[in-house]
């Protein structure tokens, strides 16, 4: 089971109208540039076989991947939203840095790896898709970690 006291984010992180609006605006801008509507990165399958108590840890993995492999490489795009949203998400990632899981997390890594593989397979359009799903990332983090 996760070390649950560390796999928590304060509700206030998701109640800041300005940065929430910027996150959702960034997602919308990117989704307008996303031509591949048949693929969904963040959805029910991501959580398959993952208990409610493990979902924040899973979302931490997705958040870190999104920051390191998607947002940082694409940081010059979708301005001015990107320059404000990336530090916000990085702060959430930092607050989850001590969120770990005790025991086997193979089932979680397997699910996250599928998401990573899909993004990599789609190349730049996969990165755009991931940015277009930042609203879903935001909501999933909120539901899993507060």
């Amino acid at each position: 089971a996760p070390i649950s006291s560390h796999c928590r984010l304060d509700k206030s992180n998701f109640q800041q109208p300005y940065i929430t609006n910027r996150t959702f605006m960034l997602a919308k801008e990117a989704s307008l540039a996303d031509n591949n509507t048949d693929v969904r990165l963040i959805g029910e399958k991501l959580f398959h076989g993952v208990s409610m108590s493990e979902r924040c840890y899973l979302m931490k993995q997705v958040l870190n991947f999104t920051l390191e492999e998607v947002l940082f490489p694409q940081s010059d795009r979708f301005q001015p939203y990107m320059q404000e949203v990336v530090p916000f998400l990085a702060r959430l990632s930092n607050r989850l840095s001590t969120c770990h899981i005790e025991g086997d997390d193979l089932h979680i890594q397997r699910n996250v790896q599928k998401l990573k593989d899909t993004v990599k397979k789609l190349g730049e359009s996969g990165e755009i898709k991931a940015i277009g799903e930042l609203d879903l990332l935001f909501m999933s983090l909120r539901n899993a970690c507060i």
Epitope: P17, T20, F24, K28, R40, G43, E44, H48, D135, L136, M139
Partner: antibody, heavy 119, light 107 residues
């Protein structure tokens, strides 16, 4: 193309039971959350229940909790609504609709099936 | 539960008119709002999702705006086919909830 066809409606006495079905085609049924929504004659829309693609999560409106059970059979591309202890206020057209996940709209709806609860 | 309040409940308009319908949520729902059109005896049809995204096949005269608690559906130039009832719906949280509907009728 996407098709949702409801069946099983009819006239039932108060306290009676009914099982509604929704046959889905034209999409990968197991990928979608499915909902039941009802509309009383001359009234607005009321969401009744939803079920996740795997069937592992279910959700109900307070007005039907304990009396209604939603289920699905992904092998048969079918959605069900078991309605027990029916009341006059359950009289409505019942629609099934699909939405990809939790944060997705109901993008396709069936034509509905009428349930009348009356003695 | 999140309450959705739609106004007006009835709206009389003429072909070519610009029509605006508003929807207010009892708490913040981000942009998780959809608009549906329903004609008598028919199932609802999705028009707008994520508050402002146009659903596939929907004419561009329909547009949506807003976020948080206040939302608007606008028909830029009303056409004969647009006389119907319109519903807003939030999908930020279960239970899903609908507004009471706005009937757009011929003046």
């Amino acid at each position: 193309q996407v098709q949702l066809v409801e069946s099983g409606g009819g006239l039932v006495k108060p306290g009676g039971s009914l099982r509604l079905s929704c046959a889905a085609s034209g999409f990968t049924f197991s990928d979608y959350y499915m909902s039941w929504i009802r509309q009383a004659p001359g009234k607005g829309l009321e969401w009744v229940s939803a079920i996740s693609g795997s069937g592992g999560s279910t959700y109900y409106a307070d007005s039907v909790k304990g009396r209604i059970t939603i289920s699905r059979d992904n092998a048969k591309n079918s959605l069900y609504l078991q309605m027990n202890s029916l009341r006059a206020e359950d009289t409505a057209v019942y629609y099934c609709a699909r939405g990809l996940w939790v944060w997705d709209p109901l993008d396709y709806w069936g034509r509905g099936t009428l349930v009348t609860v009356s003695s | 539960d999140i309450q959705m309040t739609q106004s007006p409940s009835t709206l009389s308009a003429s072909v070519g008119d610009r029509v605006t319908i508003t929807c207010r949520a009892s708490e913040g729902i981000y942009h998780w709002l959809a608009w549906y059109q329903q004609k008598p005896g028919k199932a609802p049809k999705l028009l707008i999702y994520k508050a402002s995204s146009l659903a596939s096949g929907v004419p561009s005269r329909f547009s949506g705006s807003g976020s948080g608690t206040d939302f608007t559906l606008t028909i830029s130039s009303l056409q004969p086919d647009d006389f119907a009832t319109y519903y807003c719906q939030q999908y930020s949280n279960y239970p899903l909830t609908f507004g009471g509907g706005t009937k757009v009728e011929i003046k």
